[in-house]
Interface confidence: low
């Protein structure tokens, strides 16, 4: 067991070109916090997959006020380390995410509003008691500049927080066969207290008798790969063809534990040690909490946070779901106009607009028809992206340079017969149809079927996004 | 201005239900979770459950079996029922509108009391 | 459920003195914690919350602190509308619970 601890040093704007402005103003005050998320290893875990290491949220930094006309200068941030505490071995290997959040002082009566600012991440190798480490990263135009290290809490110590350390029991000397702790001179590494066998490599344990496995381990004395294709074999002795240790028959047989919790075996029956946020026998049942970190993507948590799962994760632009996981599809929501293509940047929307648009969503026409000249009497339409020729009867083309044939389009209905004419066109209908298009059939008493009004559209309840 | 407010029948016989309405104003109850809280007369405070935006509801376990807080979100309304009431029950009960996880704006509170 | 244990009961103190009062989790609750201030006949008003926070338009002389299963409410300079109830309360875990409440007497 041990503490993660991470100092956040300073936050603001990168070197370089582009310094963004202050997020804060006179009109609406803020204050930053952090949170931070680490998982174990050093493999490309998707963003959504839970913060297994632990998550913590700093305390809120003091008000901050932009100056009028100042350059965003360094935030000031929340007092204290951010601490996260590890119940099990230190993995030594581990990925982060911290996040620098906002909270808005407006006036708000419903409390503050929150949004995200700015998020790094990286993948790290380090040993607990070691230095603070030290790290610069970027997110936009943002840096933020912090520290970092694992130690181990009373009595375990170790790089990895697996030996246990007891106090000398004799002013000079530790018992037979034991070392001191480094660097605790004055401590004694604790006699071997673990179930007998449990494995030196992937186990340890916190109580005498224990055997808790490291991940990727699994089995009542941590032998067993966890997920080991070649060892999915049927029930017998260790195979010296796979290298596997093939279990005989036991209560931890097929690991009834779920949720990635690691079975004992007990003289009756077995035993499931559960990894954070989950609990039962079988660890089936779910006891996330806010402390927790659930929320993926850089969501809030806030609400209760009982086993019966009372947290609500108020989730980033982009991401929706119960806990944040699921990215959404922005671009369904056509938010470009006028024939803009939409890219989903993840921090962002663009729009990709057409020839004669502009503005963040597409929605400003250009004047497309500035030196534009339509042939043969046709007038230059605004809004079409490029050009457009409204053309006179008889023409048609871009630029209205070509005759058109105005019965092309088959426009009379019902097998009505099509006529050019000097004025445009003329629909000959077939009997039992009447109108411009030959688009109304003629009743037997003599009315004709005219189309009713358009119902009225009743538009749907707005939508609302945390 | 945010505005809860509460109301209720007053008097209740013993092992009657009881039904009181919340009615708020100046916020949505699709954006705000809406808490209920009891106050015995001369007595501290007792959490009864929270209504949160999406509809979720979480209860004080001592209190599960007799409670039920629904609301309506178009009426701006949130109602807490509480069957096989005794006189132990006799409290002032408030509705608060929640602040996340950090605290709550409360109503003025209705007086029920419990007596035959 | 998390038990919140609040002290003293009640206190006696003058006009511009200063008064702490201490709420006790039975487990850790991190910052999990709310201050409340009642005043007969009147509903609770928060004055703090996430254990430190002071809420909008609350004076500067109401101050919290601490995390984990110890915490402290502090009221700097007494004024005479401050000798009422006050309460604490856990939003850590379902039920969210309260102290049983500190009742402020002018001496």
């Known amino acids: 067991a041990g503490v993660f601890e991470l100092q956040i040093h300073s936050f603001g704007p990168g070197p370089g070109p582009g310094a963004p402005r202050s997020p804060c103003s006179a009109r609406l005050p803020c204050r930053l916090f952090f949170r931070v998320c680490l998982k174990p290893g050093l493999s490309e875990e998707a963003a959504e997959s839970p913060c297994a290491l632990g998550a913590a949220l700093s305390a809120r930094g003091p008000v901050y006020t932009e100056q009028p006309g100042a350059p965003a200068p360094d935030l000031p941030l929340p007092d204290g380390l951010l601490q996260v505490p590890f119940r099990d071995a230190w993995p030594g290997t581990f990925s982060f995410i911290i996040e620098t959040w906002r909270e808005e002082l407006g006036d708000q009566i419903g409390g503050p509003a929150w949004s995200l600012l700015a998020r790094v991440a990286g993948r790290r190798r380090l040993a607990a008691g070691g230095p603070w480490a030290r790290d610069i990263q970027r997110a936009g135009a943002w840096e933020l500049r912090f520290s970092y290290r694992a130690r181990c809490e009373p009595p375990a110590v170790g790089t990895a927080c697996t030996r246990l350390c007891r106090p000398r029991s004799a002013p000079s000397r530790c018992g037979p066969g034991l070392r001191p702790c480094a660097p605790l001179e004055d401590e004694c590494e604790a006699p071997l207290v673990c179930r007998a066998g449990c494995s030196p490599e992937h186990g340890f344990c916190e109580q005498p008798g224990e055997c808790r496995c490291l991940e990727g381990w699994t089995g009542p004395l941590c032998t067993v790969p966890v997920s080991t294709s070649s060892c999915l074999s049927p029930r017998g002795p260790s195979s010296a063809t796979t290298g596997c240790l093939v279990p005989g028959p036991g209560p931890c047989d097929g690991n009834p534990c779920a949720n990635g919790g690691s079975c004992s075996e007990t003289p009756r029956s077995f035993e499931c040690t559960c990894p954070r946020g989950f609990y039962g026998l079988r660890c089936e049942v779910s006891g996330v909490t806010c402390a927790d970190g659930p929320c993926f993507n850089g969501g809030l948590c806030v609400g209760g946070a009982d086993p019966d799962s009372a947290y609500i994760c108020h989730c980033p632009p982009g991401f929706q779901g119960s806990n944040c996981e699921k990215r959404v599809d922005r671009c369904s929501l056509q938010p470009c106009r006028n024939g803009g293509l939409c890219l989903d940047l993840g921090h962002a929307l663009r729009c990709r607009c057409r020839a004669g648009f502009a503005g963040p969503r597409c929605e400003h026409d250009l004047d497309d028809c500035a030196g534009r000249a339509c042939a043969n009497g046709g007038t230059c339409v605004e809004g079409g992206g490029a050009h457009r020729c409204s053309c006179a009867l008889g023409f048609g083309g871009r630029d209205c340079r070509e005759r058109a044939d105005p019965c092309a389009a088959r426009p009379c209905a019902h097998g009505g017969r099509c006529y050019a004419h000097f004025s445009g066109l003329v629909c000959a209908c077939a009997p039992g149809y009447m109108g411009a298009r030959c688009e109304f059939p003629v009743h037997p008493d003599g009315a004709s079927a005219l189309p009713a009004a358009p119902p009225g559209l009743r538009p749907g309840d707005p939508q609302r996004y945390l | 201005q945010v505005q809860l407010k509460e109301s209720g029948p007053g008097l209740v016989a013993p092992s009657q239900s009881l039904s009181i309405t919340c009615t708020v104003s100046g916020f949505s109850l699709t954006d705000y979770g809406v808490s209920w809280i009891r106050q015995p007369p001369g007595k501290g405070l007792e959490w009864l459950g929270v209504?949160?935006?999406?509809?979720?509801?979480y209860y004080n376990s001592a209190l599960k079996s007799r409670l039920s807080i629904t609301k309506d979100n178009s009426k701006s309304q949130v109602f807490l029922k509480m069957n096989s009431l005794q006189t132990d029950d006799t409290a002032m009960y408030y509705c608060?509108?929640?602040?996340?996880?950090?605290?709550?704006?409360w109503g003025q509170g209705t007086l029920v009391t419990v007596s035959a | 459920d998390i038990q919140m244990t609040q002290s003293p009961a009640s206190q006696s103190a003058s006009l511009g003195e200063s008064v702490t009062i201490t709420c006790l989790a039975s487990?850790?609750?991190?910052?999990?914690l709310a201050w409340y201030q009642q005043k007969p006949g009147k509903s609770p008003q928060l004055l703090i919350y996430a254990a430190t926070s002071l809420a909008d338009g609350v004076p500067s002389r109401f101050s919290g602190s601490g995390s984990g299963t110890k915490f402290s409410f502090k009221i700097s300079s007494l004024q005479a509308e401050d000798f009422v109830s006050y309460y604490c309360?856990?939003?850590?875990?379902?039920?969210?619970?309260f102290g049983g409440g500190t009742k402020l007497e002018i001496k």
């Open positions: 309360q856990q939003l850590y875990s379902t039920p969210w619970t």
């Open positions: 209504v949160w935006g999406g509809g979720s509801t």
């Open positions: 487990q850790t609750i991190g910052t999990w």
């Open positions: 608060a509108k929640q602040r996340g996880q950090y605290g709550a704006y």
